[in-house]
């Protein structure tokens, strides 16, 4: 009996089309993605194979202007248009807490969400009962098919759930539930979810009775001979892990942003063994047109988003880079440009010993969503910005001991390469990094900004003094791992709104050209 | 609306077989399990088995198991439950119930069949 | 198998009462745990699915609670058409089992 699965994760609000590195199109005949060509690939496929599944596994929330207005209802609205078959619940999709999550997508979609290791507690446990499930079985044919969900147990850290959810750990709360569905005599069972790609390896290993695992929150690309684009592969399509009880099971992802549609083929037995896997992911360019119906709801849906965002607030003159691949390993210019708008917002001349009360910006490389393309006449938008800073925090205001932001730093690269959102961007701040040196001891020289100075110039940073700094709330409030900063900080003040912070300094500026100018080296 | 009609009251002697049928409406029909409970009179509920008429696949409760048979006619949404080898300690109503495939509870019951079995 | 034990099994109570049933599994059922009603002569009526998710229809007095081995069946004030028989049951493994049920008389 074959199965085939077609997968999307991390699609972070990419219902238009998209350019090549999945920021605005600029130029549609070489754009890509979205939810209409998506459709008109689905539907070639159901039409043509007889056993077809489409899975979400996780973080369509969060990533563009379309979540920005509609916070939600767009997803349940368009996953249920494309007749998605179920999905898991990734971290992003509780940005707004978990009423921004119940109202607008779990009540509203016509499909199972997922997850077996989210337990509700208290009033919110009779709120949400059934709204999410463990897994769900699923006819397909004349056969039925079990998905289990899970989601990353780091949720708590990387986004909003609130106190009322606990995230057990993802093997510990998936096992039961894969013996619950052998006990339904269901023998073929994929693991849907959202821990990132380690995870899914391990799941695969660990968890008895899983035939398949479908992933997401890594963004990993994995591809079996020449790629497409410009995304280099983890590994092949499928990647094959050998479970601790000898079987090998396939785990599949489908990088991100819907550029892609992951599309697998599983040959079962008679008694649910996988026999054979095989695919790859499907890049969705423009050989593949938009489905015209689904393209009219886009268009339809879009109105509200053009009064909302389209005005200019300045011109860039150069790529501001804002890819995953640059922010979360070196310094970037889109982290430079934040920075110093970060900076530029606190300007507050109370005292002439100094020339500002605060000269420090970091910022969590992760938080940096998308790159703006300069080619587009150069212009930039609300719409733009919202991509780049999607989640709504604020940039506030702390004082910190040096030895703290010494520790934070550290945090930075303790676990470098593996494109994780740690990585700092700075301003005011130079820092070099010593990678050959062991996780803890990798700061070689950190220098910051004067304050209490009439020429403003670098000094070695103090463990013991207090500093000001500015950075987003989510890092203030120890998120990506930043306990020191949640534990140790000895005053913080709420800010402004991140992206009104950057359009406000845009406005200001007119034209910008932010530059690598050597904050972040390595030696 | 959800219904499941049940077929009228039946007095079998031992040792004989009988064959309860279930109707459904108001849903489709092939997505959900449809679980057989009997009840005994003045006594508790016991589920025998269930058949999935997607793909006909049935889980009998190992008591009734080689004395019950389920069998679906999708073309008339019909579940029938043939219990053989009857015995007096098997006069009960006999109901068929809804459940999911995957989450067994029932949310929708047959009015419910009473069998006698006596000499 | 696993077994399902209701206490009490029966109990007399007045209109407006709080009523508690309780219900132990003899193994962990992992939440999944459906409460049922039923009159004299009827069908039973599912109230509660997954300890605590209310069915459509059914009065808010009626709640749930638990994990693990150990749930409750709360009756926050008790109505005339509440007297009946009640049976928890288990569907976290086949074969799914019921409570011995517990009965609701008028005091």
């Known amino acids: 009996w074959e199965l085939t699965i077609l997968h999307t994760n991390d699609v972070h609000s990419r219902l238009e089309q998209t350019s090549e590195d999945s920021s605005k199109c600029v130029n549609a005949s070489r754009c890509m993605g979205g939810v209409a060509r998506l459709f008109t690939k689905v539907q070639q496929i159901r039409r043509a194979e007889p056993n077809v599944l489409l899975l979400d596994a996780g973080d369509q929330y969060q990533g563009t202007i379309w979540f920005t207005v509609y916070k939600g209802a767009e997803v349940a609205h368009f996953m249920n248009a494309l007749r998605y078959d179920a999905m898991a619940l990734g971290n992003h999709e509780f940005d707004n807490g978990v009423e921004g999550l119940i109202e607008p997508l779990l009540k509203e979609a016509k499909f199972p969400i997922l997850s077996a290791n989210i337990k509700a507690k208290g009033p919110l446990a009779s709120q949400i009962s059934g709204l999410y499930l463990p897994y769900k079985v699923l006819p397909v044919g004349d056969e039925v098919v079990g998905i289990v969900g899970y989601t990353s147990k780091e949720t708590p850290f990387l986004s909003n759930p609130g106190t009322n959810l606990v995230f057990e750990d993802e093997i510990t709360a998936l096992q039961p539930e894969v013996d619950k569905l052998k006990t339904l005599n269901v023998n073929k069972i994929i693991a849907l979810g959202h821990s990132g790609f380690e995870m899914d390896k391990l799941i695969a290993q660990k968890v008895r009775g899983v035939d398949v695992v479908v992933g997401g929150h890594s963004n990993t690309f994995l591809y079996t001979g020449n790629p497409p684009s410009k995304e280099v592969p983890a590994g092949k399509y499928p990647f094959i892990v050998t479970s601790d009880d000898g079987r090998k099971v396939p785990v599949v992802q489908a990088y991100a942003f819907g550029k892609y549609l992951g599309y697998l083929k599983i040959e079962f037995d008679e008694r649910g063994n996988v026999i054979s896997s095989h695919g790859n992911p499907i890049l969705l360019n423009s050989s593949i047109p938009e489905d015209p119906s689904i393209k009219a709801d886009i268009n339809k849906w879009r109105i509200k988003l053009d009064n909302y965002s389209t005005q200019e607030l300045g011109k860039t003159i150069v790529y501001l880079d804002g890819s995953s691949q640059s922010c979360r390993f070196r310094e970037c210019n889109m982290g430079n440009l934040i920075c110093d708008a970060m900076i530029n917002n606190n300007l507050r001349h109370t005292d002439e010993m100094f020339w500002n009360h605060v000269s420090m910006c970091i910022l969590n490389g992760g938080g940096i969503r998308s790159p703006i393309d300069e080619r587009n006449n150069g212009t930039i938008t609300w719409e733009n910005l919202a991509a780049v800073l999607p989640f709504g925090g604020t940039f506030d205001l702390v004082q910190l001991k040096g030895s703290t932001l010494k520790k934070a730093f550290e945090h930075s690269v303790h676990r470098y390469g593996q494109s994780t959102g740690e990585f700092l961007q700075v301003g005011g701040i130079h820092v070099v990094y010593d990678l050959s040196r062991k996780p803890g001891d990798r700061v070689v020289k950190l220098d910051v900004l004067c304050t209490k100075c009439r020429v403003p110039s670098y000094d070695p940073l103090k463990m013991d003094e207090v500093y000001k700094v500015i950075l987003p709330n989510f890092l203030a409030n120890g998120g990506d791992g930043f306990q020191m900063i949640k534990d140790e900080l000895l005053r913080h003040d709420s800010g402004d709104q991140d992206i009104n912070v950057v359009s406000t300094y845009i406005s200001k500026m007119k034209v910008i050209y932010p530059a690598v100018e050597g904050r972040i080296k390595f030696s | 609306q959800v219904q499941l009609v049940q077929s009228g009251a039946e007095v079998k002697k031992p040792g004989a077989s009988v064959k309860v049928s279930c109707k459904a409406s108001g849903y489709t029909f092939t997505t959900y399990n449809m679980h057989w409970v009997r009840q005994a009179p003045g006594q508790g509920l016991e589920w025998m088995g269930a058949?999935?008429?997607?793909?006909?696949?049935?889980s009998y409760a190992q008591k009734f198991q080689g004395r019950v048979t389920m069998t679906v006619d999708t073309s008339t949404s019909t579940v029938y439950m043939e219990l053989s080898s009857l015995r007096s300690e098997d006069t009960a109503v006999y109901y068929c119930?809804?459940?999911?495939?995957?989450?067994?509870?029932?949310?929708?019951w047959g009015q419910g069949t009473l069998v006698t079995v006596s000499s | 198998d696993i077994q399902m034990t209701q206490s009490p099994s029966s109990l007399s109570a007045s209109v407006g009462d709080r009523v508690t049933i309780t219900c132990k599994a003899s193994?962990?059922?992992?939440?999944?745990l459906a409460w049922y009603q039923q009159k004299p002569g009827k069908a039973p009526k599912l109230l509660l699915s997954?300890?605590?998710s209310l069915e459509t229809g059914v009065p808010s007095r009626f709640s749930g609670s638990g994990s693990g081995t150990d749930y409750t069946l709360t009756i926050s004030s008790l109505q005339p058409e509440d007297f009946a028989t009640y049976y928890c049951q288990q569907y976290w493994s086949i074969p799914w089992t019921f409570g011995g049920g517990t009965k609701v008389e008028i005091k």
């Open positions: 058949i999935f008429p997607g793909n006909g696949h049935i």
């Open positions: 997954g300890v605590i």
């Open positions: 119930a809804r459940g999911d495939y995957d989450e067994s509870y029932f949310d929708y």
């Open positions: 193994e962990g059922i992992y939440n999944r």
